[in-house]
C-alpha cells in the first residue's frame, strides 16, 4: 500500500517562460505536522539535491512555505520540499519537474512541395527553439472542406496523408503549441499544380550526325503527372574531363519537348549532358537532374597541318642527301578525330613529285642538292587538313637572317625563351633544345611556332638543374633561316662537386694553381665564380675570389718552407661546392738560391 | 628486308633477243626509279636504261637507245628490260638497281642504294 505523502508542491506541473520569475509553494497536511512534530518553518527546500538558499524562501504559515526563483534558465529542475523532522532527519515531501522554456514562435517561410508520385510536404520555419514539447499542426482546407490534420514528427516539415487534387486552390497554415502557448502561421493559398516537382527526365540518348560535327542530339522521356502536365527543359553539358556545367540558354528550351539540339560543339569531344524539368509556367520546382548519358561528335577534317620540320644526315657522297622529315602528332582539339595517316609529297621541280603516305611521325628520304619543297597533310576518316609546307634549299644555300637578342629565363617553372624577329617576314619559327651532357648524345625535342609569336615557352617535360642548349630558327618561304643558340637552366643548384686544384708551378714565395673546369653534368647551374681558400697549419685561413672564365691562379706573397692547405669551391647563382683539399709545400729556397 | 632479284639472262647469237627481269621486294615505300646496269670484266659498271616507278618516264645509254626497252608492271613489282638486236659488245653481267632518291630519273650509277646479284648475259657471233 502506497503511503500518503505529507504534503504537495503546487503547481504539480511547472511550464516556466525562460527568463521570467517563478513561485512554488509546499503545503504540509495537519496530521503530518502533528506526527512528525514541524511545521512550515521546518521546511528545507531543494534545487536538483542541493539546498534553495533561505533568502528565496518564505514561510506563508504554519503549513505552507514558498521559494521564489528568479531568472530562470535551467531546461529542468528537479524541485523537493524536504522537512527536517526530530530536529536533523531530512524526510522528503513531495517533488516536481520544473520545466523552463519559450511559447512557440509564430512559424514562417510555410511552403509546400507535391513530389510527383507523392503526397504534399510542406515544411516552415518554426523559428527559435522552444525547449519544450511543442506539437505543430499543418491544417489544410479547401473553401468548403476540411482535410485531416497532419501532426508533424519533427516541428519543421509534414507530409500529408492525402492525394493532391490538382487545379482548385487550396489554404494550408500551421498551429504550434506547448505549455506556454499557442501560435498560427500566416495562410498560404495555392493550387497544387504549381508545386509540382516532376520525376527527373529518363532515357536521355546522345546521338551525333555524320553531316555535322559540331551537333549532338539529345532525346529523352519526360513525365509530367502522366502527361497532365506541360514540361519545359534545362540542359546542361560538359566536356568528359571538366568539372564545370555548360547552360543552354534557358529560353532556347522552353517549350515543351522531349529531344533537343545541342549546336557549336568541338569535333570527336566526348560530352557528357544532364536534364531537368519544371512546369512550363515556370511554377513549381524544379526536376532533380536525370541521369548523365555522354556522346560522342562526329569526326571533322583536321583543323590545321601538324607541326613540320626536317634534319639532314650526314651527306653520302655528292650526288644526294639523306634527309629526315620530322612532324608532331596533333592534339585531339585538331585533329578532330583519328588521325589515320599522313600524306607527304616532295616536289624537285613542276615534274619530279613523289608522294607518300605515312602513319608515323617521321620520313627519311634521300634527295639531291636540288631544292625541293615538302608539303604534310594530316588525314582522318573525314579528310586532310590543309598542307604544312617546308622549303627545304640546296646545301649549297648559305642561311641568312637569324633572330636576335635571344633570351632564356625560367619563370613559373617553366623555361621562356624570348628574341627579336629578323628584318624579313617569318613563316614560323623553329624552336629546338636538348640536356647537354659529356655522358650521352643531345637528343633534341623541339617545337613550332606561329610567326607572330617572339616569346613563349618550351613545352617538353624539363629537368631541374640541368643544362639545355635552345636553338631558334625562323623559317622563310624560301627556306630555314640562320639559327641562333644559347644554354639556360629551368632550375639552378649548387654544384654536384667543385674543383680539383693542383699546383701548376711552385715557388719559394708564389704558387701557380690550376683546375679543370666542372663537367657539364655536374656544375647543375651557370658557374659564377671561384674562391679559392688556402691557410697554413698554423695561419689563419685566406680567401681569394676568381672569376668563372679562369682555370689558373697565382698566389704570392707566400711564406717559405712552409705546408699548404688550398681548397676551391664553385659557385652557381644557387649555392657552392667545395672540391677536396689539396696540400703543397713551398721551397725554403729560390731557384738558384744559395744557402 | 629488301631484295632485288634478277632473273633472264642466257647465252643468245647476235642479233637475238632476251628479256630480263627483275623483281622487287621489302621496300617499305617504292622506290623513285628503278634501272640496269651492266659490267663487264675489268671495266666500270654502267647504266643502260632507267624507268621512274611513279610517272613510267624513262632514260637509255645511248648504246642501247633504239635497241633496249625498259618497262615495268606495278601489280607484280617488277620491272623488265627487253633487248633486241643483240650484239657482242652487250655482253656482260646485267644489275638490277633501285634508287629512292627524288628526282628525274636517271642511270646515274651514285644515286642507286640497292643492288641485285646480277644475271649474266653472253651475246656469241
Known amino acids: 500500500q502506497l503511503l500518503e505523502p505529507c504534503g504537495y508542491i503546487y503547481p504539480e506541473f511547472p511550464v516556466v517562460q525562460r527568463g521570467s520569475n517563478f513561485t512554488a509553494i509546499c503545503v504540509l497536511k495537519e496530521a503530518c505536522l502533528q506526527h512528525y512534530y514541524v511545521n512550515a518553518s521546518y521546511i528545507v527546500w531543494k534545487t536538483n539535491h542541493a539546498a534553495v538558499p533561505r533568502e528565496q524562501v518564505t514561510v506563508i504559515n504554519r503549513t505552507t512555505s514558498s521559494v521564489t526563483f528568479t531568472d530562470v534558465v535551467l531546461p529542468s529542475v528537479q524541485l523537493t520540499c524536504n522537512i527536517l523532522s526530530f530536529g536533523q532527519i531530512e524526510q522528503n515531501v513531495y517533488g516536481v519537474t520544473m520545466l523552463s522554456g519559450f511559447p512557440p514562435d509564430k512559424p514562417t517561410n510555410l511552403t509546400c512541395i507535391v513530389n510527383e508520385g507523392k503526397n504534399m510536404l510542406c515544411q516552415w520555419d518554426p523559428g527559435r527553439e522552444t525547449y519544450l514539447e511543442t506539437n505543430y499542426t499543418l491544417k489544410s482546407e479547401w473553401a468548403t472542406e476540411k482535410f485531416p490534420d497532419c501532426q508533424s514528427k519533427h516541428g519543421t516539415s509534414c507530409m500529408v496523408s492525402y492525394m493532391p487534387t490538382y487545379y482548385v486552390n487550396i489554404e494550408v497554415w500551421v498551429e504550434a503549441e506547448n505549455a506556454l502557448g499557442k501560435v498560427s502561421s500566416e495562410s498560404i493559398n495555392f493550387d497544387p499544380v504549381d508545386k509540382v516537382k516532376p520525376t527527373p527526365p529518363y532515357n536521355l540518348s546522345v546521338t551525333n550526325s555524320e553531316e555535322l560535327s559540331s551537333i549532338l542530339k539529345l532525346s529523352w522521356v519526360s513525365s509530367g503527372l502522366g502527361g497532365l502536365l506541360d514540361l519545359k527543359s534545362d540542359i546542361q553539358y560538359r566536356t568528359k574531363d571538366a568539372s564545370t556545367w555548360i547552360q543552354v540558354p534557358l529560353e532556347d528550351t522552353m517549350s515543351p519537348r522531349t529531344s533537343f539540339t545541342v549546336q557549336d560543339l568541338k569535333p570527336f569531344t566526348e560530352y557528357v549532358f544532364r536534364i531537368r524539368s519544371i512546369k512550363d509556367s515556370g511554377k513549381g520546382y524544379w526536376s532533380d537532374w536525370s541521369e548523365e548519358a555522354s556522346g560522342t561528335t562526329y569526326e571533322d577534317r583536321p583543323s590545321r597541318p601538324p607541326s613540320f620540320w626536317y634534319k639532314t644526315n650526314p651527306s653520302h657522297g655528292q650526288e644526294y642527301r639523306s634527309v629526315r622529315l620530322i612532324w608532331k602528332a596533333l592534339p585531339l582539339s585538331e585533329a578532330n578525330g583519328k588521325i589515320l595517316d599522313y600524306e607527304v609529297i616532295l616536289t624537285q621541280s613542276k615534274s619530279v613529285s613523289q608522294t607518300y603516305t605515312v602513319t608515323g611521325t617521321e620520313l627519311t628520304v634521300n634527295l639531291t642538292n636540288d631544292r625541293y619543297v615538302a608539303s604534310l597533310a594530316a588525314r582522318n576518316k573525314v579528310g586532310k587538313s590543309a598542307a604544312a609546307v617546308l622549303t627545304i634549299p640546296s646545301p649549297h644555300v648559305t642561311a641568312a637572317y637569324s633572330v636576335v637578342n635571344l633570351k632564356a629565363f625560367p619563370k613559373d617553372n617553366l623555361l621562356w625563351v624570348e628574341w627579336t624577329p629578323p628584318p624579313k617576314p617569318v613563316s614560323k619559327y623553329i624552336l629546338e633544345w636538348c640536356v647537354l651532357s659529356e655522358n650521352a648524345p643531345c637528343v633534341e625535342d623541339w617545337q613550332q611556332e606561329d610567326a607572330t609569336v617572339n616569346r613563349t615557352h618550351l613545352r617538353g617535360r624539363l629537368l631541374e638543374s640541368k643544362c639545355y642548349q635552345i636553338t631558334v630558327t625562323p623559317v622563310f618561304a624560301t627556306g630555314p633561316g640562320g639559327s641562333e643558340s644559347l644554354k639556360a637552366y629551368l632550375k639552378q643548384a649548387a654544384p654536384a662537386r667543385g674543383p680539383t686544384v693542383r699546383t701548376k708551378k711552385v715557388g719559394k714565395n708564389e704558387a701557380v694553381l690550376a683546375w679543370d673546369q666542372i663537367p657539364v653534368d655536374d656544375q647543375n647551374g651557370f658557374i659564377r665564380n671561384y674562391s679559392i681558400s688556402y691557410r697554413t697549419s698554423v695561419g689563419k685561413e685566406m680567401v681569394v675570389h676568381v672569376d668563372s672564365s679562369h682555370t689558373e691562379y697565382t698566389l704570392s706573397s707566400l711564406s717559405s718552407d712552409t705546408l699548404y692547405m688550398v681548397r676551391m669551391a664553385a659557385y652557381t647563382d644557387e649555392g657552392g661546392k667545395d672540391g677536396p683539399e689539396f696540400t703543397f709545400t713551398t721551397p725554403k729556397f729560390a731557384q738558384g738560391e744559395i744557402e | 628486308q629488301v631484295q632485288l632479284q634478277e632473273s633472264g639472262g642466257g647465252s643468245v647469237q647476235a642479233g637475238g633477243s632476251l628479256r630480263l627481269s627483275c623483281g622487287i621486294s621489302g621496300f617499305t615505300y617504292r622506290p623513285t626509279f628503278m634501272g640496269w646496269f651492266r659490267q663487264v670484266l675489268g671495266k666500270e659498271r654502267e647504266g643502260v636504261a632507267a624507268i621512274s616507278t611513279g610517272g613510267g618516264s624513262s632514260v637509255y645509254a645511248d648504246s642501247v637507245k633504239g635497241r633496249f626497252t625498259v618497262s615495268q608492271d606495278s601489280s607484280k613489282n617488277t620491272v623488265y628490260l627487253e633487248m633486241n638486236g643483240l650484239k657482242l659488245e652487250d655482253t656482260g653481267m646485267y644489275y638490277c638497281?633501285?634508287?629512292?632518291?627524288?628526282?628525274?630519273?636517271?642511270?646515274?650509277?651514285?644515286?642507286?642504294?640497292?643492288w641485285g646479284q646480277g644475271t649474266q648475259v653472253t651475246v656469241s657471233s
Open positions: 638497281a633501285a634508287s629512292t632518291v627524288i628526282t628525274s630519273v636517271s642511270i646515274n650509277r651514285a644515286l642507286y642504294q640497292y
